[in-house]
Each structure stands twice: as structure tokens, then as C-alpha cells.
């Protein structure tokens, strides 16, 4: 509808324009994870703050039970950062004995669940070997990309080791999505 | 306004649609930081190139004195990458003596300043321990997320050690924001 | 056009509004790289999956011969993640002999090619020294930012060492762009 002129019409059909301000959007922030039952053979899912501090959901984008619910079909930009922290990894301890070894690792996965589809879909994965040598280590993994989602899809963030997630500050570990 | 038909009306009210091309946007790129005075008890803020090369500000998004000024309220996607570089960290030097130690670290914070609010708000933080062992090390920290900002808010990027920022190339260290 | 009222007019001029759903967008995912001839003095470019699995191109954004073709001028958000994996780097082997050394490194560059301009433009670079000490290492580099592009511009992703790219999963290594 670029700069066109229109004569008034009783049957004027408009393209599917919409106000940007009413698009589904969410930014969720870290909370301390309480021990829960996780699905077998699947990394545990994080749960999130959705209304306090920097966190919000709006325009029918709802958060429930570790999932962001997609209220309408379209292309979404989805992002997450998880900050991990830990002590010296076994990897470096084994290394000191001079043997090659499988490294420790940290992994973040943003997963899509579609009720009509039996298996979750991994949308994004960030995975990193950790062979740190200082007594404490900490580092973030950031992910973000665009995906075509359907109304009713659910998004979650899974991590390889929930006990290594830094839950201390809302700016260190977060998860968000917005309709483009 | 999805595919609806409208009869002309003397009082037709339109939703707050707007051309995407007139939304506030900025992409700032690194410049060399010269020694300056910084606020006490706060990581130093970077200053930026805002008009040469890949850098730009548009549609009333202005850059002044290390700050991006938010010209209208709304949801913004904000991002930054800072590439750090340094020599072997003290951490690894101490480590060679066989003692556990507090690691060196590098940190990036995207901060919001609201004049009516006494304390800056940390929107995003990327922090990483550095226990490198080669003679030179370098690595980026990337951040990006969506936030609800108010007209008049100011954004800046703070770093833990300003003298370790790689200022050599505009594609290595940058800062941007755009209204969704 | 915020909440204004309009009397019908035979000459009503509209701002350049457009449906979000018809904007050029692409998300490309990793495929196994086959050995090809690379340009001298330039990091090799990755080629991508553009229609299977999570990958798509839409609204005249086309993928051809390692390039994303920009179909219309405007501000685009461009992103990529490349996951690298390798064996213990020479850096750490040399280090064990007690000599200082130049670190190995991994680098990702998102490059713009404009036919009318002789030299490619590096838009984004993520570069990281790799002095890992475990026998296997792996890690992602993520990049994303907004750029003003012109119709006909071409985008590609270059990497320092194509043989270290993890091509095993579409969620680990990807490349995308969308018109804002």
C-alpha cells in the first residue's frame, strides 16, 4: 500500500495491516529453579518470571508452566541467554593426569512443542565444551533466530544442567519472543 | 484490520498504524576510547561512532555523550557485541603456581537510565570468566533482547575493563536498538 | 497515523504502510560443506539449506550460490550462529613446551557484496581465540545486528576454517535476515 491514492469505495478491501503495538510479545527472566520431575531423555526445562521487573507478556502471548504459548501464526523472532557458572570441571582435573578426555559441556536448547506432533522440535541450540582451569568459571550462551510458528505452538528453554544456571539476576538469564 | 471491508465513514477511526520506515533505529560502531573520567562504582561506558561507515541513527533516535536517546515509548529490540582482547590473564599466571584463584572476567552491561529514577537499570548482562593460557586471547560477548522503553529513556553500554575492548574494526564491537 | 480520524476523500494519500507478512525473510540452516574453490585472501563462504526442515525463504528473499539476495532496500536484521568443533589446538600443544604462542582462532564474518562496489563489506565479525586443553572442544559464535541494505545486495557467511564447522544439526549453525 505504498503511497497510493484511494477513491472511497463501499467495498474497499484492506491488506492484513495491523498495529505493531498489538503484536504478541514476551520477555521472561530467570527465577531460581526448584527441583522438579523432568522428562526422561530430555534436558530439563527452565521456568521463568513473566511479570515482575523487566519481564512481561502482552497481546495474548501467555506464559504457563515453563511454556510460552503462541497465540497466532506468523514469523517470530525468538531469543534466549543462559548464564552458566560452576567450579573447575572434571575435564581439567582429568587433563592434569595427562590423559585425553571427553570435555564437560553446557548446552541451551530452545524447543518447540506442537500438540499435534509427537516429538518436540529443537529450534536453536548453543553448546560449548567447558575445560576451565580457574576454580570458578562462568559464561553465557546466547541464541536468537526467526521461525515460522503456528497458533498453539509452545516454546520452552532446556538446559543440560539446571544446577549450573545463574539465577541471581534478571539481566543474565532470559527468554523472549515477538511476532515480526 | 485483517481483510475487513469498510464502508466510508465521516468518523472512521484508524488503529495506530505507522510506516515501518519511520521507526526510531540506530546501529553504533566502536571507536577508540580515550582515557576519561568515569562514574565511581559503575563500569565505564563506551562511546560510539554514530554516522560514519556502518553506523547510523534515524527517525529521531539520537546519540549523544555515550547515550542512545529513546524518542518514543514502545517495545525495542536492543543489542550489542563487545569484542575483548588481552594478554595472558593473571588468573593463569597464579594458576601456574598451583593455587586455586578467583578468575579474571569480562563483562558487558546494557544499561537504561531514566531521569525520573535515581538508579540505572541493568537490562542485559554478559559476563565471562577468562582463564586463558595462550599469550594473546580475544573473544566477543553478544547480547540482545526486547524491552519496553519510555520516551526520554537513555541507553548505554558499560564494560568491566575499557582498555580490553577491541576498537580496531566496526564489525567487532557495536551497539544498536530499533522500535518493534 | 496514530488514532486519527479521517473524513473520506477522493485524494486520501496513505503513508507507505505494508503488511508485515509480505516482508522479505529467510532462515537458512547448515548443510555439510563440500570442498570448493574459495576466493584468495577471503575466508571461505558457507552454503546453506533454504527449504527443508526449519529453513525457508519468503517474499522474494532468495538464496542462491551461498548468497542471500536482498530484494528491496530497507533496514534488515541479520543474524548467524556457527558452531565450531575441533581437537586440541596447536596452541595448547606449543604451550606445553613452555613457549608463548599465537593462539589458534575461530572467526565468523557476515559479509555484504554490492555489485557496483569492488570490495565486499564486513558487516559483523565474531572472532575468538581457541586455546582449549581437552581433547575435543566445541563452541558457538553468534552474531546479529541491523543494517541498511540496498536492493540487489548479497549476504554471505564466511568462516576462518570450514572444516571445523559443525554441520550435524540445523539448530546449531544457521543464518537469517528479515526486513524490519
Amino acid at each position: 500500500l505504498k503511497g497510493q491514492e484511494f477513491a472511497p469505495s463501499h467495498q474497499q478491501v484492506y491488506a492484513p495491516l495491523r498495529a505493531d503495538g498489538d503484536k504478541p510479545r514476551a520477555h521472561l527472566t530467570v527465577v531460581r529453579q526448584t527441583p522438579t520431575q523432568h522428562f526422561k531423555n530430555q534436558f530439563p526445562a527452565l521456568h521463568w518470571e513473566h511479570e515482575l521487573g523487566l519481564a512481561f507478556t502482552k497481546n495474548r502471548m501467555n506464559y504457563t508452566n515453563k511454556f510460552l504459548l503462541i497465540p497466532e501464526s506468523g514469523d517470530y523472532f525468538i531469543y534466549s541467554q543462559v548464564t552458566f557458572r560452576g567450579m573447575t570441571s572434571e575435564c581439567s582435573e582429568i587433563r592434569q593426569a595427562g590423559r585425553p578426555n571427553k570435555p564437560d559441556s553446557i548446552t541451551v536448547v530452545i524447543t518447540k512443542v506442537t500438540d499435534s506432533y509427537p516429538e518436540p522440535t529443537q529450534l536453536l541450540m548453543g553448546t560449548k565444551s567447558v575445560c576451565e582451569v580457574g576454580s570458578n568459571w562462568f559464561q553465557p550462551i546466547y541464541l536468537g533466530a526467526m521461525f515460522s510458528l503456528q497458533e498453539g505452538d509452545k516454546l520452552m528453554v532446556n538446559v543440560s544442567d539446571i544446577s549450573l544456571v545463574d539465577y541471581t539476576k534478571e539481566d543474565k538469564t532470559f527468554f523472549g519472543a515477538f511476532l515480526l | 484490520l485483517k481483510g475487513q471491508e469498510f464502508a466510508p465513514s465521516h468518523q472512521q477511526v484508524y488503529a495506530p498504524l505507522r510506516a515501518d520506515g519511520d521507526k526510531p533505529r540506530a546501529h553504533l560502531t566502536v571507536v577508540r576510547q580515550t582515557p576519561t573520567q568515569h562514574f565511581k562504582n559503575q563500569f565505564p561506558a563506551l562511546h560510539w561512532e554514530h554516522e560514519l561507515g556502518l553506523a547510523f541513527t534515524k527517525n529521531r533516535m539520537n546519540y549523544t555523550n555515550k547515550f542512545l536517546l529513546i524518542p518514543e515509548s514502545g517495545d525495542y529490540f536492543i543489542y550489542s557485541q563487545v569484542t575483548f582482547r588481552g594478554m595472558t590473564s593473571e588468573c593463569s599466571e597464579i594458576r601456574q603456581a598451583g593455587r586455586p584463584n578467583k578468575p579474571d572476567s569480562i563483562t558487558v552491561v546494557i544499561t537504561k537510565v531514566t531521569d525520573s529514577y535515581p538508579e540505572p537499570t541493568q537490562l542485559l548482562m554478559g559476563t565471562k570468566s577468562v582463564c586463558e593460557v595462550g599469550s594473546n586471547w580475544f573473544q566477543p560477548i553478544y547480547l540482545g533482547a526486547m524491552f519496553s522503553l519510555q520516551e526520554g529513556d537513555k541507553l548505554m553500554v558499560n564494560v568491566s575493563d575499557i582498555s580490553l575492548v577491541d576498537y580496531t574494526k566496526e564489525d567487532k564491537t557495536f551497539f544498536g536498538a530499533f522500535l518493534l | 497515523l496514530k488514532g486519527q480520524e479521517f473524513a473520506p476523500s477522493h485524494q486520501q494519500v496513505y503513508a507507505p504502510l505494508r503488511a508485515d507478512g509480505d516482508k522479505p525473510r529467510a532462515h537458512l540452516t547448515v548443510v555439510r560443506q563440500t570442498p570448493t574453490q574459495h576466493f584468495k585472501n577471503q575466508f571461505p563462504a558457507l552454503h546453506w539449506e533454504h527449504e527443508l526442515g526449519l529453513a525457508f525463504t519468503k517474499n522474494r528473499m532468495n538464496y542462491t550460490n551461498k548468497f542471500l539476495l536482498i530484494p528491496e532496500s530497507g533496514d534488515y536484521f541479520i543474524y548467524s550462529q556457527v558452531t565450531f568443533r575441533g581437537m586440541t589446538s596447536e596452541c595448547s600443544e606449543i604451550r606445553q613446551a613452555g613457549r608463548p604462542n599465537k593462539p589458534d582462532s575461530i572467526t565468523v564474518v557476515i559479509t555484504k557484496v554490492t555489485d557496483s562496489y569492488p570490495e565486499p563489506t564486513q558487516l559483523l565479525m565474531g572472532t575468538k581465540s581457541v586455546c582449549e586443553v581437552g581433547s575435543n572442544w566445541f563452541q558457538p559464535i553468534y552474531l546479529g545486528a541491523m543494517f541498511s541494505l540496498q536492493e540487489g545486495d548479497k549476504l554471505m557467511v564466511n568462516v576462518s576454517d570450514i572444516s571445523l564447522v559443525d554441520y550435524t544439526k540445523e539448530d546449531k549453525t544457521f543464518f537469517g535476515a528479515f526486513l524490519l
Epitope: - | R32, Q33, T34, P35, T36, Q37, H38, P44, G86, M87, E90, S135, N136, D161, I162, S163, L164, V165, D166, Y167, T168, K169 | P100, K102
Partner: antibody, heavy 118, light 107 residues
């Protein structure tokens, strides 16, 4: 205005030590690395080492290792360079310099002439 | 240590001349190359960083180029105040090393 003011000229005997001071003003002293560079008469520039005033961490050129010590006093925004076991080859102008990044030298002190003579 | 060499070691030029000084590193230093100007009896003055980026306040007649091992400093139109000695310096790895200098004097 960023300024580095160095102590005055020194005359030393071979085998002695010299300690040169460098007082910084106009910027946050702890945020930027302080370097020491020397220049023998009619010769080029030679980097000696740095201090990170925040952590106190130092790095020295191998040539000076074991003979040079760089320290700082953050309470008075001052860095010091001490060079031991002086010989006539150490006769030079010694500069402190601060960089906006650790690998370059934006602002220089006025220099301190150290003469080693028997 | 990375060895920096400069050429020529000295040159004579007139006001208005275009002057080019080259600097070579013994190994790749990426873009971590800085240029300084020094006048007799004075401390050096920082001109160019990152091989090609002009330090704030430095006249635009100065420019730098190169990456890897070969670098150039160019003065497009020599001014009376530009007669001095010019040093390149690598900031890639410790110890930081300088070139031997190029003296630019009046023809």
C-alpha cells in the same frame, strides 16, 4: 584535561637503582593501563612494561624481567617504575604513557632523563 | 618478539609533498598497528590506531593503511609542522615493539 606529570631528572651510578614517578590526572586512573617506554639518546622507542592500576597486575618485556618493577598508589593516582642494577646502557629518557586500550599509548608524560655515569 | 622495520630511515621533502612511509612486521599483526609522531625533545604524539583509523584531533592529511604484515603511513600534503620522526608500533602481542623510526626533514 588528561595529564601525566613525571618526576625530575636523575643521575645515578652504575649498579644503583632509580625510581621514577608518574602522577595522573583528568581521568579515572584505575580504568586504563599505564605503560613505561624508554628512549636512549638519538635512538628509538623501547617498551618496558605495563601495570593494570585496577588489579596491580604487571607485564614486562623479557629484556627487563627481574630488573624492573612497576607499582602504583591508587590513592594518589600515581605509578612508579623502578629499575635496578643500572648500567650506562640505561641512560635514557623514561616516559610513562596511558592508553585508551592496553596496546597503545594515547597520552605521554613529559619524560624523565636518567643518566647513569661513574 | 615481533620485529618492526621501517623504510626509508629518513627522507627529505618539501611543503606540499605527498609522503609515504612503510612499516613491516616480522609476523602477521592483523590491524593492531599504531603510528606516532615525535619532534626533538618532546614526547611522541599518537596519530593513527588500528592501522587506518585517525586518532581524534589529528589532521585528515594523515592516513594509514594495511593489515597483516605490511602497513603504510601517508601524509597527503606535507605541512611545516609535520617535519618530525615517525614510529610504527605493533599492539598485537607482548612485548610491544616499535619500528626504528623514519625522520622526515626539509629538502
Amino acid at each position: 584535561e588528561v595529564q601525566l606529570v613525571q618526576s625530575g631528572a636523575e643521575v645515578k651510578s652504575p649498579g644503583a637503582s632509580v625510581k621514577v614517578s608518574c602522577k595522573a590526572s583528568g581521568y579515572t586512573f584505575t580504568a586504563y593501563y599505564m605503560h613505561w617506554v624508554r628512549q636512549a639518546p638519538g635512538q628509538g622507542l623501547e617498551w618496558m612494561g605495563w601495570i593494570n592500576p585496577n588489579s596491580g597486575g604487571t607485564k614486562y618485556a623479557q629484556k627487563f624481567q627481574g630488573r624492573v618493577t612497576v607499582t602504583r598508589d591508587t590513592s594518589i593516582s600515581t605509578a612508579y617504575m623502578e629499575l635496578n642494577r643500572l648500567t650506562s646502557d640505561d641512560t635514557a629518557v623514561y616516559y610513562c604513557a596511558v592508553g585508551g586500550s592496553y596496546d597503545a599509548f594515547d597520552i605521554w608524560g613529559q619524560g624523565t632523563m636518567v643518566t647513569v655515569s661513574s | 618478539d615481533i620485529v618492526m622495520t621501517q623504510s626509508p630511515s629518513s627522507l627529505s621533502a618539501s611543503v606540499g609533498d605527498r609522503v609515504t612511509i612503510t612499516c613491516r612486521a616480522s609476523q602477521s599483526i592483523s590491524s593492531y598497528l599504531n603510528w606516532y609522531q615525535q619532534k626533538p625533545g618532546k614526547a611522541p604524539n599518537f596519530l593513527i590506531y588500528g592501522a587506518s583509523r585517525l586518532q581524534s584531533g589529528v589532521p585528515s592529511r594523515f592516513s594509514g593503511s594495511g593489515s597483516g604484515t605490511d602497513f603504510t603511513l601517508t601524509i597527503s600534503s606535507l605541512q611545516p609542522e609535520d617535519f618530525a620522526t615517525y614510529y610504527c608500533q605493533q599492539g598485537y602481542s607482548s612485548p610491544f615493539t616499535f619500528g626504528p623510526g623514519t625522520k622526515v626533514d626539509i629538502k
